[in-house]
Interface confidence: low
């Protein structure tokens, strides 16, 4: 199953302790998928598409980005015949930066 | 082989039910999606509606949302297309279509076998 | 929605002759396109899934291509049973959209 789209999406967070926006979107026409988001190889938010869309967008709040280190993936599940569940392929990384203090 | 026969098409006045159906053989009915897809006379194909092989996802174009409910039943290999509150823009033959990927890892929307269709007229 | 524009409307050409139809998306619909054939009084018949894998059963003179949004259908050398208008339609996203159509007939 082809890798879901990741991105961040505004307002982008200008600290860590500000909250992150990622979307996250399958390719093709998946109804009702189950996303999950990584961080460092490790979960962190599980989010269900309504059956009507093809992405979702997790809201991660302030602090969230402190640990685990490392970029962000998505990944999702669909159903597929005797309702097995399989999983995509691992979205491209996305990294979350913050810009540097000036004092 | 493949086989999709739809019925319940006629004249109906504005605001008025029909009921339409599709009886299929030559496949496993309940491991596919299906669809009805509409055509206005003189005119292009429109999607309608969409269910999926075991009955827990639908979903359904906005000309027809709320008036529109498809549903299926497996045990006798029919699909149904009840229309409420038809109008007259809902004039067409339509049709059902099965969905080519036998559940969701491949998407929605390879429709690869038609039936021949069934007219339905809303007039006065 | 995603809108399907089909181009020409019509397409005037004799047996033999090679036809080419294009279908534009109003935005990218990846790969998720399928072209179909319909003859007057006929359900449509699937021709071509996901740009250029050719339906079961479909001749080899039928090829698509493209991705993105610009799509083409090509018949390499039209027979007459190919005189037919053919629609493109688009699984990207709901709802699916057809395109208006080309119809294909003799010079």
């Known amino acids: 199953i082809p890798a879901p789209s990741i991105r961040l999406v505004p307002p982008y967070p200008s600290s860590q302790e500000d909250p992150i926006h990622i979307a996250c979107m399958a390719p093709g026409n998946f109804p009702g998928a189950n996303f999950t988001l990584y961080r460092g190889g490790q979960v962190v938010q599980l989010l269900q598409a309504p059956t009507d869309q093809r992405g979702v967008t997790f809201n991660l709040s302030g602090g969230s980005s402190k640990a685990p280190g490392g970029p962000f993936h998505c990944q999702y599940g669909v159903l597929g015949e005797l309702n097995q569940s399989q999983l995509s392929d691992l979205s491209e990384p996305v990294n979350v930066s913050f810009p540097v203090p000036t004092w | 082989q493949v086989q999709l026969v739809e019925s319940g098409g006629g004249v109906v006045q504005p605001g008025r039910s029909l009921r339409v159906s599709c009886a299929v053989s030559g496949f496993t009915f309940s491991s596919y999606g299906m669809h009805w897809v509409r055509q206005a006379p003189g005119g292009g194909l429109e999607w309608v509606a969409v269910m999926s092989y075991e009955g827990s996802f639908r979903h359904y174009a906005d000309s027809v949302k709320g008036r529109f409910t498809i549903s299926r039943d497996n045990s006798k290999n029919t699909l149904f297309l009840q229309m409420d509150s038809l109008r007259a823009e809902d004039t067409a033959v339509y049709y059902c279509a099965r969905d080519r990927p036998a559940g969701y890892t491949s998407g929605w929307g390879i429709l690869d076998y038609w039936g021949q269709g069934t007219l339905v007229t809303v007039s006065s | 929605e995603i809108v399907m524009t089909q181009s020409p409307a019509t397409l005037s050409l004799s047996p033999g002759e090679r036809a080419t139809l294009s279908c534009r998306a109003s935005q990218s619909v990846s790969s998720y396109l399928a072209w179909y054939q319909q003859k007057p009084g006929q359900a449509p018949r699937l021709l071509i899934y996901?740009?250029?894998n050719r339906a079961t059963g479909i001749p080899a003179r039928f090829s698509g291509s493209g991705s993105g949004t610009d799509f083409t259908l090509t018949i390499s050398s039209l027979e007459p049973e190919d005189f037919a208008v053919y629609y493109c339609q688009q699984r990207s996203n709901w709802p699916l959209t057809f395109g208006g159509g080309t119809k294909v007939d003799i010079k």
């Open positions: 996901d740009a250029s």
